[in-house]
């Protein structure tokens, strides 16, 4: 049994780091493998993650962490029984993938303005809470070419757009994702999308 693709890990900078790797053949990850992780710090103990299958030869492990600070560094040991298959390390602050925003809502009752709001996925005491910026993706269900991205570079988890920038009388979907420049993170996954019917009063044409 050998590791074909070494574990790579990302942290949500809150409570979970996710490591993925591939074995050289079909593997029952949860019965054959264990990923041990230990904070490199005084009096810390090793903790065990039981991996799950992620495709035939792929494994994924969700490492539970109490919290994360920038200095944290973990040793990782991948075991198959008594055999050490791989040894490495992981610094969560250097591999951050934020949590996806939630509760995306489209408010259509504000005159001819669309107000999109969502929730910051972090609690106020988490460092990322005040450092997230967002990208909002809006697209038409009827017209694949009608696809747009709005970058929200302020901290407020909301976006206002004129309803008239979208076509009237058709359905649109929106989703939002987050990233944090401070830790040069990757983008989060997209939030679940939300759907609404776009309709607004066309202004009277004056001749």
């Amino acid at each position: 049994m050998k590791v074909l693709q070494e574990p790579t890990c990302v942290s949500d900078y809150m409570s979970i780091s996710t490591c993925e790797w591939k074995m050289n053949g079909p593997t029952n990850c949860s019965t054959e493998l264990r990923l041990l992780y230990q904070l490199v710090f005084l009096l810390s103990e090793a903790h065990t993650c039981i991996p799950e299958n992620n495709g035939g030869a792929g494994c994924v492990c969700h490492l539970l962490m109490d919290d994360v600070v920038s200095a944290d560094n973990y040793t990782l040991d991948l075991w198959a029984g008594q055999q050490l298959l791989w040894k490495g390390s992981f610094k969560p602050s250097e591999h951050v993938k934020p949590r996806a925003p939630g509760n995306l809502t489209v408010h259509t009752n504000v005159s001819d303005t669309l107000l999109l709001t969502w929730s910051n996925p972090y609690p106020p005491d988490n460092y990322l809470y005040n450092h997230l910026t967002y990208a909002v993706n809006i697209w038409s269900e009827n017209d694949p070419a009608d696809f747009r991205i709005y970058n929200v570079t302020y901290l407020e988890p909301s976006l206002r757009i004129a309803a008239s920038t979208l076509k009237s009388g058709i359905s649109y979907r929106a989703r939002v994702r987050a990233w944090a420049q401070c830790y040069n993170t990757t983008w989060s996954e997209w939030s679940p999308s939300t759907k609404w019917h776009n309709s607004y009063r066309e202004p009277f044409e004056q001749h």
Partner: antibody
Framework: EVQLVESGGGLEQPGGSLRLSCAGS????????MTWVRQAPGKGLEWVSS????????YYADSVKGRFTISRDNSKNTLYLQMNSLRAEDTAVYYC??????????????????WGQGTTVTVSS | DIVMTQSPLSLPVTPGEPASISCRSS???????????LDWYLQKSGQSPQLLIY???NRASGVPDRFSGSGSGTDFTLKISRVEAEDVGFYYC?????????FGQGTKLEIK
């Protein structure tokens, strides 16, 4: 009530051995690291040794390394300090103290928040 | 090893007056944001040490609010806003960032 009670101190000749014990109660003993600190007569406090909750990790002061062994029996909620090759400079009151919570991924530290009453070790011929 | 230096070593105080003890470390005790591994302990005559402050500024359970800790990195301070007779004893700072854990020499607080 969270409590630590030391025992095992006494008078011993140079080169001799003693085993100190520290019985914990009122907290989940196995979840916490434990530490020994000593105080020579009329002197300040000196750290001696520490051990993680499972006993897998131990640390020693240079002055006792190779002579003292820290261990624990979590089934008995007891911490030990085996002291061999005793020297006159080991004469002190020995305290055990409850250290950080090591059952968590990040050891949670709230100081050495509980101390035993101390046990006196005298090394003299 | 990290060397801890306390000052003053002797501190005569009038009851009701404030008192301040300084502690300096030879290396930074800041592990990461919000984690300075510096404690303060009080040892009264004939007793075991008791924890006053942990992680530089957190008051231990049951410690009166006249005791406060501050500082970060290498410079730390213990303040007593109004000294009471029961506060006499030796005050020690201690670092637990790295082994060996090291203590300051101790400050003897006495009532004038």
């Amino acid at each position: 009530e969270v409590q630590l009670v030391e025992s095992g101190g006494g008078l011993e000749q140079p080169g001799g051995s003693l085993r100190l014990s520290c019985a914990g109660s009122g907290f989940t003993f196995r979840d916490y690291a434990m530490t020994w600190v000593r105080q020579a007569p009329g002197k300040g406090l000196e750290w001696v040794s520490s051990i993680s909750g499972s006993g897998s990790t131990t640390y020693y002061a240079d002055s006792v390394k190779g002579r003292f062994t820290i261990s624990r029996d979590n089934s008995k909620n007891t911490l030990y300090l085996q002291m061999n090759s005793l020297r006159a400079e080991d004469t002190a009151v020995y305290y055990c103290a409850k250290d950080r919570l090591t059952a968590s991924v990040r050891p949670i530290y709230v100081g050495l928040d509980v101390w035993g009453q101390g046990t006196t070790v005298t090394v003299s011929s | 090893d990290i060397v801890m230096t306390q000052s003053p070593l002797s501190l005569p105080v009038t009851p009701g007056e404030p008192a301040s003890i300084s502690c300096r470390s030879s290396q930074s005790l800041l592990y990461s944001e919000g984690y300075n591994y510096l404690d303060w302990y009080l040892q009264k005559s004939g007793q075991s040490p008791q924890l006053l402050i942990y992680l530089a500024s957190n008051r231990a359970s049951g410690v009166p609010d006249r005791f406060s800790g501050s500082g970060s990195g290498t410079d730390f301070t213990l303040k007593i806003s109004r000294v009471e007779a029961e506060d006499v004893g030796f005050y020690y700072c201690m670092q637990t960032l790295k082994t060996p854990y090291t203590f300051g020499q101790g400050t003897k607080l006495e009532i004038k």
